[in-house]
Structure formats: structure tokens, C-alpha cells
Interface confidence: low
């Protein structure tokens, strides 16, 4: 187990022409926050696929108001690191998505509005326990600078967080064949070669494949407690035979999972499913608070200011789940009447009505063209007591006042899939391509806008890509 840590250094206009407009204004002050999504391996999955290694949301940054006439500066950032805990081994190779979100603080009905400002993605090699690697990524006219590392949580050590350290049994040296655990020199590296299933609490090994029991435990996997009360000839602590044994409890007996976690047996031992706010092998670690950014997709975290109180995620429209991690398909409720086409734009539902119908849900039957005007060069077409506008290219809607589907122009290059989004569109790139419009080919060696660090990790230097 361990933690992936991301430090955002700056987010602002990239070099070169076409500096982006500031995302905030005097009329609409806003603040930024970031979301990181991690996936194992050098995956080429779409942005919508699950963050199998984990995800995290930053705190909100300071409120920012654009100075009139001034170019967009580097924007004020949230304090602190984004931390993504991982339970299992660190995979060594991973893919990341870092999203920069804007929270508008104007007089929105129903609270703040969230919109995605930029999304960068990449694929990297990274050894746990190594130094901070630095990176620069561009998304359109924006540039994001950040550092990242993976570190193991004790007792795990090593480049994959798979070696374990244990306190020394003797003050002077480690057991046979075991090394001191750098950098914890007062601890010893625990062997990884015991028999599969050997109890980590009550068993140990000095040779590969064996499972020797600590005093008071027995059985092939040292999971059976020794009963001494009715013993005539008690056997030594390493005995795997019967003699003075009582049937041992199953791994879930007595429920080893703390804090209301539920226990399920596994081939090796047990697994705890933890309630919200707790994690760890036995759900013993509390302390997931709003500061940890547990709410995804712009969810607003409430409560949970201290580790003992639970947090609640208030999800923006279109998302649900205890961490706002699930997208709601609100169109499945068929809210658009009269054959209207339903569009879920994230922050709202939009119905695109058939000719002759109008209204938020296409509930109104329309008159003919009398007194009707079609905007943006559209022409009114009568028929059957209804009117419709035949709109010029690039416009749509009842009166041609709406811009057409942003994906209609096929803006995603190289076979990327386009998704209509409430801030415009998002491209999910085909394997081998990346960028806001999938315009950049990924380098053949698996690098994206910057090269992946080779095995052994190097601090890939971004300067040469400026």
C-alpha cells in the first residue's frame, strides 16, 4: 500500500500566441480545483473509463477575479498535495488524467456552477520511493506544471511497495537472511517467500515456501491457536501436527474489520469492505475528510472537518453515488415529450424538439409561421398547423438560436470520440493519440507530450519542450 502524490505548481496560459481568456471575470469570480485520475499500466483507455488506481480531488483554490484588460496570469492554486492512496502494489507504469475545473461563484440559481477548463493526460513509468518527477503538459492554450511521486506506507517498502518491514526481534541484528530495511535501519525486511497463505501475524519463514508458527499458533498456515488447557504433551510452537489443538476460528470469526466494515473470506485470509470514511486492511484507518477531496466530478463536500465525522458529497446534476463517482443517465427517464431528443449536458438536461413543438420538455405545440422569426439566417417552413425553422449551417433549435451540436463537425482528430459537454466538447482519443482534439500522436516509446521516464526513474526534464 502507498500514496501517489501530485503537487500542482502552476496553471496558466501556455507560451506562444493565442493566450486564453481568463476563466474568471469581475461579473463571474471563480476559483480552480483539480482532479487526478490514475489507471495502472500504459493504458489507452478513454477518459471515461474507471480510475482503477484511484482518484482525488483538490481543495478549492482562492477566489480569483480578472483584472479588466489584463492578460490571464497564472491562476491562484489550491493549497496542498493531491493524494491518491493505493491499497495494493504500485504498478510501476501508470496513466494519469489531470483535470482543471472552474467553480463559478456568481449568482447561479442552485449554487455554484462547475465547468471543465482543461484536461491533460499522459503515461509514465515511476518507481515508488523515488524522488519527485516534474512535468509540463499543455491543453489547448493552457499549460499545467506539476510534480508527482509514489511513496509506500509503512510497513511496505520497495519500488512496488511489496516488500514489508517489521520491527526487529533482536536489538542487534535481523534474522537469518534478512536485511535492515532502508531507510528504517531499526527495522528488518520481512521475507516475501513464505508459503502462500502463511498468517502474516502468527507465521514467519526462514526458507522459501515454509511457514513456521509463533508461540501459541499452529497449523500449516499458523492460523490455528494452540490450546494448552487439556494438553498432556504440548508440542513446540512450530508444530504443524495435532496434539493439543482445538479447531481454529475462520478468518472472519469475530469480525476483524473495525468501524463497521464487513468481512469476507479469501483464499489467503480475509478482506474488509470498509464504510465511507475508513480504509486500511481492517478499516482501522479513519480520517477521510473533506480536505482529502473525496467527492468527484465537482461534488461539494460537506462536514467531515475532523476524521471522526463523516463527510457527505453533494453531487452536481448528472452525478450520484457516495462520492459522486457515478454518472446518472437522466435521459433514460424519457423526459422529452412529443418525440424530442434528450441531451444530458451534465449541468442540465436539454430537449431538442421535433418540428412543431417547443418548450423545455417539448410540451408546447407551435403555431404556423405567422409572426415567427427564425434567427441566424434560418427560414420558416409551414406545415400541418405547426412551424419549424430550417436553420443555416451551424445553428439549430426551434428558432435557430442554438448553436448546433459541437460534435457535429467531427472535431476530434485521428478517430477520437466526441462527447458533448456543458463547457463545449471533450475528445476521448483513440490509442496512440492525445491532446484536447487528439491532435498529438503519442511517441512510439510510450511517451506523450513528454517522454516517459525509463526504468529506474529519471527526472524527465520539461524545459526542452518549452
Amino acid at each position: 500500500a502507498g500514496v501517489f502524490e501530485l503537487q500542482i505548481h502552476s496553471f496558466g496560459p501556455g507560451p506562444g500566441p493565442g493566450a486564453p481568456r481568463s476563466p474568471c471575470s469581475a461579473r463571474l469570480p471563480c476559483r480552480l480545483f483539480f482532479r487526478v485520475c490514475l489507471k495502472p499500466g500504459l493504458s489507452e483507455e478513454a477518459a471515461e473509463s474507471p480510475c482503477a488506481l484511484g482518484a482525488a480531488l483538490s481543495a478549492r483554490g482562492p477566489v480569483y477575479t480578472e483584472q479588466p484588460g489584463a492578460p490571464a496570469p497564472d491562476l491562484p492554486l489550491p493549497d496542498g498535495l493531491l493524494q491518491v492512496p493505493f491499497r495494493d502494489a504500485w504498478p510501476g507504469t501508470f496513466s494519469f488524467i489531470i483535470e482543471t475545473w472552474r467553480e463559478e461563484l456568481g449568482d447561479q440559481i442552485g449554487g455554484p456552477a462547475w465547468s471543465l477548463l482543461a484536461r491533460v493526460a499522459g503515461r509514465r513509468r515511476l518507481a515508488a520511493g523515488g524522488p519527485w518527477a516534474r512535468d509540463i503538459q499543455r491543453a489547448g492554450a493552457w499549460e499545467l506544471r506539476f510534480s508527482y511521486r509514489a511513496r509506500c506506507e509503512p510497513p511496505a517498502v520497495g519500488t512496488a511497495c511489496t516488500r514489508l518491514c517489521r520491527p526487529r526481534s533482536a536489538p542487534s541484528r535481523c534474522g537469518p537472511g534478512l536485511r535492515p530495511c532502508a531507510p528504517l535501519e531499526d527495522e528488518c525486511e520481512a521475507p516475501l517467500v513464505c508459503r502462500a497463505g502463511c498468517s502474516p501475524e502468527h507465521g514467519f519463514c526462514e526458507q522459501p515456501g515454509e511457514c513456521r508458527c509463533l508461540e501459541g499458533w499452529t497449523g500449516p498456515l499458523c492460523t490455528v491457536p494452540v490450546s494448552t488447557s487439556s494438553c498432556l504433551s504440548p508440542r513446540g510452537p512450530s508444530s504443524a501436527t495435532t496434539g493439543c489443538l482445538v479447531p481454529g476460528p475462520g478468518p472472519c470469526d469475530g469480525n476483524p474489520c473495525a468501524n463497521g466494515g464487513s468481512c469476507s473470506e479469501t483464499p489467503r485470509s480475509f478482506e474488509c469492505t470498509c464504510p465511507r470514511g475508513f480504509y486500511g486492511l481492517r478499516c482501522e484507518v479513519s480520517g477521510v475528510t473533506c480536505a482529502d477531496g473525496p467527492c468527484f466530478n465537482g461534488g461539494l463536500c460537506v462536514g467531515g472537518a475532523d476524521p471522526d465525522s463523516a463527510y457527505i458529497c453533494h453531487c452536481p446534476p448528472g452525478f450520484q453515488g457516495s462520492n459522486c463517482e457515478k454518472r446518472v443517465d437522466r435521459c433514460s427517464l424519457q423526459p422529452c415529450r412529443n418525440g424530442g431528443l434528450c441531451l444530458d449536458l451534465g449541468h442540465a438536461l436539454r430537449c431538442r424538439c421535433r418540428a412543431g413543438f417547443a418548450g423545455p420538455r417539448c410540451e408546447h405545440d407551435l403555431d404556423d409561421c405567422a409572426g415567427r422569426a427564425c434567427a441566424n439566417g434560418g427560414t420558416c417552413v409551414e406545415g400541418g398547423g405547426a412551424h419549424r425553422c430550417s436553420c443555416a449551417l451551424g445553428f439549430g433549435g426551434r428558432d435557430c438560436r442554438e448553436r448546433a451540436d459541437p460534435c457535429a463537425a467531427r472535431p476530434c482528430a485521428h478517430g477520437g470520440r466526441c462527447y458533448a459537454h456543458f463547457s463545449g466538447l471533450v475528445c476521448a482519443c483513440a490509442p496512440g493519440y492525445m491532446g484536447a482534439r487528439c491532435e498529438f500522436p503519442v511517441h512510439p516509446d510510450g511517451a506523450s507530450a513528454l517522454p516517459a521516464a525509463p526504468p529506474g526513474l529519471r527526472p524527465g526534464d520539461p524545459q526542452r519542450y518549452l
Epitope: 505548481h9 502552476s10 498535495l81 519527485w132 506544471r145 529519471r458 526534464d461
Partner: antibody, heavy 122, light 107 residues
């Protein structure tokens, strides 16, 4: 203009610790990595580690010094500190702080402090 | 760690001459190499970053070249103030390392 001003010379006994300061001015302190480099008398340059002042826990240390060096920062005074413990005579050197060239990235060092001579002698 | 070997250790030239300093890495460091100048009693000064990128305020007579493992710093026409020690530095892998230096002295 960018300036890095270091604390004065120190004389320490073996086994003691020394804490050298580096006060930055003329730029946004929290945005640039600060590196520490040392130079023993008549010798070359040796990289000790670096710190990102925007987050005090964001540090990289040379494995050679990892168990003895600690880098910290105080954003209220725009000062970075390098503490070296368990001093030995071979730690006698001039210790430099230096700022790296670009915000959040790059490893070349374009602005340097004047250096602090640390002498370890019994 | 990556070892940087600078040669020659000492180079004796006269003002107006061309100086060529070499830095060889024990393994490929791509273009993650920088050059510094250091005068007695002073801190080092960055001359060239990323093999060949110039630094503002550094005279145009300083230039860099090379790739992979072999790199060169060239001073096209030596001025009296150029006599100093020159170090290369790699930032391709941890720990960051410096070369042993080349002392450029007046002949």
C-alpha cells in the same frame, strides 16, 4: 532583481548539526525549486537535494545525505533552510543554495547564493 | 549514478584563442546537460542549459553542443575574464551530478 542571501559562516564540532538559511527575494518564492549544492575545499560541486517551497514536504534528497539532511522552508519570510546532522570533518565545505530556472520544472540553476562556509573541527 | 568526466582537467590558452571543453557521461543523458563557470571565491554561474540553450546575460562567445554521452562547451575567442573553472551538470537521473571540472588558465 532575484537574490538569494545565505547565513554566515559556521564552525561546528563533529557529531553536531548545522542549519544554513537562504533568504529569497525578487521573485515568487513558492513557485521555484531551491537546490542545495556543496563544495569541499579545492573540490568539485556535489548536489545534496532540493525543495519545492510551495509545499514543504516536496523534497528530493541525494541518497548519500538522506539520513542526515533535512530541507525546510518558511513562506512567511521566503527562507529555505538546510540542516545537516551528525557532522564529520569531511562535511567541511561551502554550502550553496540555488534557484532552478523555471516555475515548477527544470533542474538547471540560474541564481545562486553567495555560499556559507561550514567548518567541522574538534 | 551517472559519472561525468571532464577533459582536459586543465587547459592553458591565451586570450583571443578558441577553447573547447569536453564532458563525457557514463551513459546517455539525452540533452539534460548544463554548463557552469566558477571563479575563485564566487558561486557558480549558469552559462548554457540543455546542451545548447543560451542564458540571458551570458556573452554569445559561449556555445554548447553534443548529445547522448558526449558534450562540448566552446568559447570562440577567450577574454581575460573567461579564465575560471568550468563544470558540466547532468539532470537526467538521480542523483544529479556534476563533472570534476576543467580549469581554464592563462598560458
Amino acid at each position: 532583481q532575484v537574490q538569494l542571501v545565505q547565513s554566515g559562516a559556521e564552525v561546528k564540532k563533529p557529531g553536531a548539526s548545522v542549519k544554513v538559511s537562504c533568504k529569497a527575494s525578487g521573485y515568487t518564492f513558492i513557485s521555484y525549486w531551491i537546490t542545495w549544492v556543496r563544495q569541499a575545499p579545492g573540490q568539485g560541486l556535489e548536489w545534496m537535494g532540493d525543495i519545492y517551497p510551495g509545499s514543504g514536504s516536496t523534497t528530493n534528497y541525494n541518497e548519500k545525505f538522506k539520513s542526515r539532511v533535512t530541507m525546510t522552508r518558511d513562506t512567511s519570510t521566503s527562507t529555505v533552510y538546510m540542516e545537516l546532522s551528525s557532522l564529520r570533518s569531511e562535511d567541511t565545505a561551502v554550502y550553496y543554495c540555488a534557484r532552478e530556472t523555471t516555475v515548477g520544472g527544470a533542474y538547471a540553476m540560474d541564481y545562486w547564493g553567495q555560499g556559507t562556509l561550514v567548518t567541522v573541527s574538534s | 549514478e551517472i559519472v561525468l568526466t571532464q577533459s582536459p582537467a586543465t587547459l592553458s590558452l591565451s586570450p583571443g584563442e578558441r577553447a573547447t571543453l569536453s564532458c563525457r557521461a557514463s551513459q546517455s543523458i539525452n540533452n539534460n546537460l548544463h554548463w557552469y563557470q566558477q571563479k575563485p571565491g564566487q558561486a557558480p554561474r549558469l552559462l548554457i542549459k540543455y546542451v545548447s540553450q543560451s542564458i540571458s546575460g551570458i556573452p554569445a562567445r559561449f556555445s554548447g553542443s553534443g548529445s547522448g554521452t558526449d558534450f562540448t562547451l566552446t568559447i570562440s575567442s577567450l577574454e581575460p575574464e573567461d579564465f575560471a573553472v568550468y563544470y558540466c551538470q547532468q539532470t537526467n537521473s538521480w542523483p544529479l551530478t556534476f563533472g570534476g571540472g576543467t580549469k581554464l588558465e592563462i598560458k
